[in-house]
Amino acid sequence: NQDLPVIKCVLINHKNNDSSVGKSSSYPMVSESPEDLGCALRPQSSGTVYEAAAVEVDVSASITLQVLVDAPGNISCLWVFKHSSLNCQPHFDLQNRGVVSMVILKMTETQAGEYLLFIQSEATNYTILFTVSIRNTLLYTLRRPYFRKMENQDALVCISESVPEPIVEWVLCDSQGESCKEESPAVVKKEEKVLHELFGTDIRCCARNELGRECTRLFTIDLNQTPQTTLPQLFLKVGEPLWIRCKAVHVNHGFGLTWELENKALEEGNYFEMSTYSTNRTMIRILFAFVSSVARNDTGYYTCSSSKHPSQSALVTIVEKGFINATNSSEDYEIDQYEEFCFSVRFKAYPQIRCTWTFSRKSFPCEQKGLDNGYSISKFCNHKHQPGEYIFHAENDDAQFTKMFTLNIRRKPQVLAEASASQASCFSDGYPLPSWTWKKCSDKSPNCTEEITEGVWNRKANRKVFGQWVSSSTLNMSEAIKGFLVKCCAYNSLGTSCETILLNSPGPFPFIQDNIS
């Protein structure tokens, strides 16, 4: 065994920042630190065969399989994948170890399989086997967490039935409003399923796994807070558990809380109370209303009353199916080049949506914010003043919603020209869409003021580049203008731009750009 080389097999993950495909050893990528693959000598195999731990990667991921060999002298090598030999160029690192790499860019199903590396050193020959598969995320799920009361204890259990099993955490905050943002110092996270401290201002439970993170807030009515202008509304689907917490603080213990549904007291077993003294010796009481599996008849106004506070209500609506309510009519916007502007969509949805903003086939993360009136809003400001079509897409378990936006940036035209033997064409992307003029430059008209009207063909918006309209104008060549300089000008309310073309013979043409504001 001591005669065998010391082999280290590693996997290097790359964060793609290009779209190249293929195998190469020079790549414009950001690499994560190498991950050991526990290369082991395969027992009872003919010849010296090492095997690396099986590698599982996401589709489209870019990786490097690498072997580091601690053996004296030079090494030669050969990669074999699906009976094809692949080029192999070993090099030596700073510790004088032989390094052999196989780069897999943009992993696809066809690139999954066994990669065999044959190495020949001065002392011995050996083989290293890598098995690469694509992670099967089709079976993965991430479900929104829900609450259950812990048996015989005043505590809540947070459950998320997801695959792979999620990490469950409670996110607690004791201040109001903005300071309860996820990364605020006021927020405390507890990575456990059971929560005993149920008196906090804001209580959420989150579950996360490979697919992301889903959270559920414990719906709360605080009798010490001024009621919202619109009645708080809670949506649930048939069969889901209902949890509403009513919270009240008073100078002493001499007060009680009760829940009513449509003026009828909740049945025993559908509520439980907890109380504690706060640091300033005031009494905090909380009363939970809960239904383990709601039915249509659980819909209605739930009112929490106190002997020492004004009562407050919430409207609970039980639906058969989830929904997304928003206006889906497309919207067009016209803004100046430096004007601050955000697209926004206002919607009401249950369950909570997953959403994306898309422009030019590229997706952007989507943030949503709850409004006081039960609606939510998603804004997109990262358009970088690029004109075109922007798409908002939202979905939840039961519904889908798409809304289109067109953004036009008011700007002066910019002209590009091209010419062939029979015609000259000019293109412009300014907005509002420009109008065109063609002028002939001659001895009679050295300033190119002689207008050409014959043989001109204008096409508004002939090419739609992700919603960005391009206007063009074409001049058919006639004997009268052959050999002359012509000038095409595009103009709109923001200015004019021209390009001068020499109409001589086919081939490269000299273009002279001419900007007139």
Epitope: A40, R42, A54, E210
Partner: antibody, heavy 125, light 107 residues
């Protein structure tokens, strides 16, 4: 450099729940098929295997301690957590976590290849 | 559960001696079996896996044999650094089980 590091309380009271965390570095719990086992060793006694979590998130437990153990992992943090309820003085031991690579199509393994240095837990009132 | 019976529980030997430790499984475990060495205050380290395959970096004086239910660890010429406790492990069937250990002491 492959390392596994156990962390958790040094002292636990009887009936309490013990939570131990194994933080790994130099290898991935996500991109390679790697399992992690917990093993313990009471002072002067033999090694005892406790629990294992597979790369596909499946779990398996010691027959005698099954009802008290829960193993979970957080691949993004590179952590494997073991919780043991109803602690008793006989649970006083050094607790180790160890790595198990899975080979071929991820079906076979050769046991633990790298171990953490261990964390000593004393159960006493 | 599969029982692993290791013998002897302890032995005294001198530097240069040939040492043999055996482990018996209560049922057939094929060659899903390994040997570990543990020094006081340290974590165990794998010596052999698959009954007879030497872990990379382990001296060739260590060797293993056996299959099914009977397994042997042999140290051909004991060195000062080999004085430690040795454990066998079966990883054929869950729950995995260790032998009770063999302490190799200086004579």
């Amino acid at each position: 450099q492959v390392t596994l590091k156990e962390s958790g309380p040094v002292l636990v009271k009887p009936t309490e729940t013990l939570t131990l965390t194994c933080t790994v570095s130099g290898f991935s719990l996500r991109n390679a098929r790697m399992g992690v086992s917990w093993i313990r060793q009471p002072p002067g006694k033999a090694l005892e295997w406790l629990a294992h979590i597979f790369s596909n998130d499946e779990k398996t437990y010691s027959t005698s301690l099954k009802s008290r153990l829960t193993i979970s992992r957080d691949t993004s943090k590179g952590q494997v957590v073991l919780t043991m309820t109803k602690m008793d003085p006989v649970d006083t031991a050094t607790y180790y976590c160890a790595r198990i690579p899975y080979y071929g199509s991820g079906s076979h393994n050769y046991g633990m290849d790298v171990w953490g240095q261990g964390t000593t837990v004393t159960v006493s009132s | 559960d599969i029982q692993m019976t290791q013998s002897p529980s302890s032995l005294s030997a001198s530097v240069g001696d040939r040492v043999t430790i055996t482990c018996r499984a209560s049922q057939d475990i094929r060659n899903d079996f390994g040997w570990y060495q543990q020094k006081p205050g340290k974590a165990p380290q794998r010596l052999l896996y698959a009954a007879s395959t030497l872990q990379s970096g382990v001296p060739s004086r260590f060797s293993g044999s056996g299959s099914g239910t009977e397994f042997t660890l042999t140290i051909s010429s004991l060195q000062p650094e080999d004085f430690a406790t040795y454990y066998c492990l079966q990883y054929n069937t869950y729950p995995w089980t260790f032998g009770q250990g063999t302490k190799v002491e200086i004579k």
